[in-house]
């Protein structure tokens, strides 16, 4: 009975102690996009710088081919920013055959591929009409909640429009996760 | 070995076990801020309540003269948001020359200060144009992301324009870190 | 002594250990929200999804009537999306009077209740002017932030105006707390 | 409804601090900044700096840096200013204003209090 | 150092409509909460007329209306009255936070 008095009487043997310090963690940073084709009605999705600068993978996180890739099953927080730049969107110029026009906008969505499960599960999606008058524009948009994974789950960013993101500094547009 | 059973083999010796109860955290939320000259092409950085209201500053971590000081080197989540105001910005009045004008706009910044190191280095940015026809505006900006920090950095909130900080309300504009 | 060594001196007794993966988390995602009578001056609450889906509230964080009831006492990370959309809102129209139309707008706030306290205490508020020309518009607001909160207190979200919620996705309206 | 009720008119010498007080009523005092301004004799407005009753935070004007002090009493409701190192130019009405949060406009005001300043 | 630059007087007579400007000499003037204008009647205490250039708080005529165009603000009471003598102030806020004053503009009413 000994050791007993260093583990609580509410964390049973289910529920083993883990140190903080080696949890799955990532923090990946925005790199310039290289072309590349995707299908008219799919959203890009978006690489990542994952070890220079601000950038780290951690505790068997990894990141390849435009995905992290969950190590192990558990509670995640999972968070993203992209910064959209553009021209002005003139739909200022409202009535065309008497209605308005659809807007323009700018989207991102952070996705969940499951190997076994065909289709991936968006997760996170913010999305804004872009509808700026006489200037060229600039936003970010934000996102961040916590997810249930399973090990071997993949996270990706999905964007609607890859030539409108902001990728010249590592503090605009970033991709995270970590387990909680 | 008597101990070791509430020790899982995955705990190693070179990551001990805490207590998340003791972990450095903050939460700082918006005062009034006061006249001070700034220079025109630096960013002046936010001070903040650390006690009152819905503010605190726990184990270790504490607010001095507008930076939180990084009691302990680990990763961290860090986070903000600023709310800004302001009069109409006349960019609707929008050729000028021809050509559309530079937009008014609204930025923050988190930014580390680690004094071994002569640059600051800015962590997170969420910068938005600023063209709002007709109306008075308000709008926040929010960031945060994890970050690997070191014991004694320094981080600061920076904003493009104070004069437009609305800092009536502690759940308008705040800013916080906390050791994962 | 023997089972010291597992034990480092900085977690002393005041702090026991606990296992992460019994830690209260909850994350709710939106439904469509019925009608509901709510008072002039006051934000109306969500109701929301706590099972199907994306969403789920474990280790004894319950969802009951619009409130996620906190179970135990100690440090919470929270946070929300909202995504609004609606039609134009004319404030381009914006001489009556020879002065600018006072702006629609859009809001969330987290907020808490306490039992024991008479009035509901905002922990984040996100607040939008929206004057879009010539579209209908969609945007989200998002909020994250940690407070110390209390067993037995409860959070919701309001909205300034519960008929521009996008119910419509799972992963554009959401909202969720977790013990740190 | 909202009142500022300030002190009785003082006179000093130079060298001396004045400590001039405005009282509060009508209103949650704790909620709404208050600002102090004067106006010397047939010239215009000086602000001179605001005060949080609440926290007891307070940004002052750069020309009356070291020199002012605004205080406030939450049980009493009432504001203070004092001003150090008092000069001949410091002959002025000072007045307190409750200020409105989203506008930073001064919405109501003091009846003001004549400070003189004379050897 | 900004400066907020009125005239010094104006006049008008009683019914006629008179305009009082309020220049800047910096476009970050007035950028967070916009320009607020004051009346003081002789021997009193500054009462607020106009607040974020165009609102008028209750109890204030709508012969008082204020506007903005550029770096300026303006002040116009139409239907002049004998008891709207007195000075007015703009007042502002500038981009270290310091509360501006206009240097005041006397209004005389004619006859």
């Known amino acids: 009975l000994k050791g007993q008095e260093f583990a609580p009487s509410h964390q049973q043997v289910y529920a083993p102690l883990r140190a903080d310090g080696d949890k799955p963690r990532a923090h990946l940073t925005v790199v310039r996009q290289t072309p590349t084709q995707h299908f008219k009605n799919q959203f890009p999705a978006l690489h990542w710088e994952h070890e220079l600068g601000l950038a780290f993978t951690k505790n068997r996180m990894n990141y390849t081919n435009k995905f992290l890739l969950i190590p192990e099953s558990g509670d995640y927080f999972i968070y993203s920013q992209v910064t959209f730049r553009g021209m002005t969107s003139e739909c200022s110029e409202i009535r065309q055959a008497g209605r308005p026009n659809k807007p323009d906008s700018i989207t991102v969505v952070i996705t969940k591929v499951t190997d076994s499960y065909p289709e991936p599960t968006q997760l996170l999606m913010g999305t804004k009409s872009v509808c700026e008058v006489g200037s060229n524009w600039f936003q970010p948009i934000y996102l961040g909640a916590m997810f249930s994974l399973q090990e071997g789950d993949k996270l990706m960013v999905n964007v609607s429009d890859i030539s409108l993101v902001d990728y010249t500094k590592e503090d605009k547009t970033f991709f995270g996760a970590f387990l909680l | 070995l008597k101990g070791q059973e509430f020790a899982p083999s995955h705990q190693q010796v070179y990551a001990p076990l805490r207590a998340d109860g003791d972990k450095p955290r903050a939460h700082l939320t918006v005062v009034r801020q006061t006249p001070t000259q700034h220079f025109k092409n630096q960013f002046p950085a936010l001070h903040w309540e650390h006690e009152l209201g819905l503010a605190f500053t726990k184990n270790r971590m504490n607010y001095t003269n507008k930076f939180l000081l990084i009691p302990e080197s680990g990763d961290y989540f860090i986070y903000s948001q600023v709310t800004f105001r302001g009069m109409t910005s006349e960019c609707s009045e929008i050729r000028q020359a021809g050509r559309p004008n530079k937009p008014d706009s609204i930025t923050v910044v988190i930014t580390k200060v680690t004094d071994s190191y002569p640059e600051p280095t800015q962590l997170l940015m969420g910068t938005k144009s600023v063209c709002e026809v007709g109306s008075n505006w308000f709008q926040p900006i929010y960031l945060g992301a994890m970050f690997s920090l070191q014991e004694g950095d320094k981080l600061m909130v920076n904003v493009s324009d104070i004069s437009l900080v609305d800092y009536t309300k502690e759940d308008k504009t705040f800013f916080g870190a906390f050791l994962l | 002594l023997k089972g010291q060594e597992f034990a480092p001196s900085h977690q002393q007794v005041y702090a026991p250990l606990r296992a992460d993966g019994d830690k209260p988390r909850a994350h709710l995602t939106v439904v469509r929200q019925t009608p509901t009578q709510h008072f002039k001056n006051q934000f109306p609450a969500l109701h929301w999804e706590h099972e199907l889906g994306l969403a789920f509230t474990k280790n004894r964080m319950n969802y009951t009537n619009k409130f996620l009831l906190i179970p135990e006492s100690g440090d919470y990370f929270i946070y929300s999306q909202v995504t609004f959309r609606g039609m134009t809102s004319e404030c381009s129209e914006i001489r009556q009077a020879g002065r600018p139309n006072k702006p629609d707008s859009i809001t969330v706030v987290i907020t808490k209740v306490t039992d024991s306290y008479p009035e509901p205490t905002q922990l984040l508020m996100g607040t939008k002017s929206v004057c879009e020309v010539g579209s209908n518009w969609f945007q989200p607001i998002y909020l994250g932030a940690m407070f110390s909160l209390q067993e037995g207190d409860k959070l919701m979200v309001n909205v300034s105006d519960i008929s521009l919620v996008d119910y419509t996705k799972e992963d554009k309206t959401f909202f969720g707390a977790f013990l740190l | 409804q909202v009142q500022l009720v300030q002190s009785g008119a003082e006179v000093k010498k130079p060298g001396a601090s004045v400590k001039v007080s405005c009282k509060a009523s009508?209103?949650?005092?704790?909620?709404?900044?208050i600002n102090w301004v004067r106006q010397a004799p047939g010239q215009g407005l000086e602000w001179m700096g605001w005060?949080?009753?609440?926290?007891?935070?307070?940004g002052y004007a750069q020309k009356f840096q070291g020199r002012v002090t605004m205080t406030a009493d939450r049980s009493t409701s009432t504001a203070y200013m004092e001003l150090s190192s008092l000069r001949s130019e410091d002959t002025a009405v000072y007045y307190c204003a409750r200020e409105v949060p989203e506008t930073a406009a001064f919405e109501y005001w003091g009846q003001g209090t004549l400070v003189t300043v004379s050897s | 150092q900004s400066v907020l630059t009125q005239p010094p007087s104006v006049s008008g007579a009683p019914g006629q409509r008179v305009t009082i400007s309020c220049t800047s000499s910096s476009s970050d003037i007035g950028a967070g909460q916009g320009v607020h204008w004051y009346q003081q009647l002789p021997g009193t205490a500054p009462k607020l007329l106009i607040e974020g250039y165009y609102n008028r708080p209750s109890g204030v005529p709508d012969r008082f209306s204020g506007s903005k165009s550029g770096t300026s603000a303006s002040l116009t009471i139409t239907g002049l009255l004998p008891e709207d003598e007195g000075d007015y102030y703009c007042?502002?806020?500038?981009?270290?936070?310091?509360?501006?004053f206009g240097g005041g503009t006397k209004l005389t009413v004619l006859g």
């Open positions: 005060l949080n009753p609440n926290s007891g935070n307070t």
């Open positions: 009508g209103y949650t005092f704790t909620s709404y900044d």
């Open positions: 007042q502002s806020w500038d981009g270290t936070l310091s509360a501006l």
